[in-house]
């Protein structure tokens, strides 16, 4: 029961996480820049992985896509790649984990197969989460190192003087969504891996059985080529080949190491 709960919870957490990674990747607010001191209109500039937008206080918003790969930083391309890899791995992981769920019966699928599928999806979720966290962190680092401060003008009055000031380029909402989503996917993956251990069937110890012939005190010796009859050359009941069975004289009520395989 605990295994099913762990697996189910892991699946749900990962599902939420991957939905968050997709949302973060599509969002425009990866970075934001505020220019509130503009005397014309307050301009809110925000950028995503795929397009850049400018919103004015009047409500007018203009968004333009990055139609060229040239001129875009390699880091931005790397972030795009990491996020896409994270989504693809997560999606495959979700597909695999659906069939691995203990509560879902698909034909005569054995628990060992479900355990393997659970582990596979768990690993995929972990890698997916790490990709998202890495992508978001790389973008955040790019912001801090390259574009954290940007020069802009500040107008001291409607007809006043103009002076140059620094405006901050801050983390957008998408970064936080990405971090949280990546973390959830990672946690979900770990839960799936834990559930896998509970799903795997444990090895059973089977007791060895001695088979006795009905006549002439003949003991069947597995693996041996002769059976002792108690007569003839082997009158002292010497062991000819001990494959786990014994002659009647040797059979005792107490257990020995040969009783277990």
């Amino acid at each position: 029961m605990a295994v099913t709960a762990c697996q189910g919870l892991g699946f749900v957490v990962s599902l939420i996480g991957i939905a968050g990674i997709i949302a973060a990747t599509c969002m425009d607010q990866w970075s934001t820049q505020d220019l509130y001191n503009n005397p014309v209109t307050a301009v809110f500039n925000y950028q995503g992985l795929w397009r850049s937008c400018v919103r004015e206080s009047s409500g007018f918003t203009e968004c333009r896509g990055y139609f060229t790969l040239l001129g875009l930083p390699a880091m931005l391309q790397a972030v795009r790649a990491l996020m896409i890899v994270g989504i693809v791995l997560g999606a495959i992981g979700l597909l695999v984990s659906i069939f691995a769920l203990k509560c879902i019966r698909i034909g005569s699928m054995e628990d060992s197969a479900k355990a393997n599928m659970t582990l596979t999806s768990g690993i995929m979720f972990i890698v997916s989460g790490l990709c998202a966290i890495a992508g978001v962190s790389v973008f955040a680092n790019m912001l801090v190192t390259n574009f954290w401060m940007s020069t802009a003008n500040m107008y001291t009055g409607m007809g006043g003087m103009v002076q140059t000031v620094q405006t901050r380029y801050t983390f957008g909402a998408a970064l936080f969504v990405g971090w949280v989503a990546g973390g959830l996917t990672l946690i979900g993956g770990v839960m799936m891996c834990i559930a896998c251990r509970g799903l795997a069937p444990e090895e059973t110890n089977y007791k060895a059985v001695s088979y006795h012939a009905s006549g002439h005190s003949v003991a069947y010796k597995p693996g041996g080529f002769k059976a002792s009859t108690g007569f003839g050359s082997n009158t002292k009941n010497k062991k000819i080949y001990d494959g786990g069975a014994r002659t009647e004289d040797e059979v005792q009520s107490y257990p020995s190491k040969h009783d277990y395989v």
């Epitope: 820049q33 004015e56 203009e62 875009l72 574009f147 380029y169």
Partner: nanobody, 121 residues
Amino acid sequence: QVQLVESGGGLVQPGGSLRLSCAASGSIFSIPVMTWVRQAPGKGLEWVAGISKGGTSNYADSVKGRFTISRDNSKNTLYLQMNSLRAEDTAVYYCNAQASSFGWMPLSDYWGQGTLVTVSS
């Protein structure tokens, strides 16, 4: 980079009119706000008028009712129609644009080289 080139300045009599133009060129991604700023001889920079891409415009009190700002978004060009010019309007007029050369770049300020407007009889 974004380049701004002003034109239309010159000598005009008080009460006369003049039309300034500012053409933006280069690797322009977005120009949300364009403004005119002037610098009278021996004085600091003074903001005159500005217009956003959405059409919001604003004017300094000293030019309200006399100056009209407009822009052609398709040509990335800013205009300033100056009527009823006074001697105190004599200054070098600079075009200023808050623009980004690439989408992932923050909005930055770009300036023209300026055009001289002299109001004298």
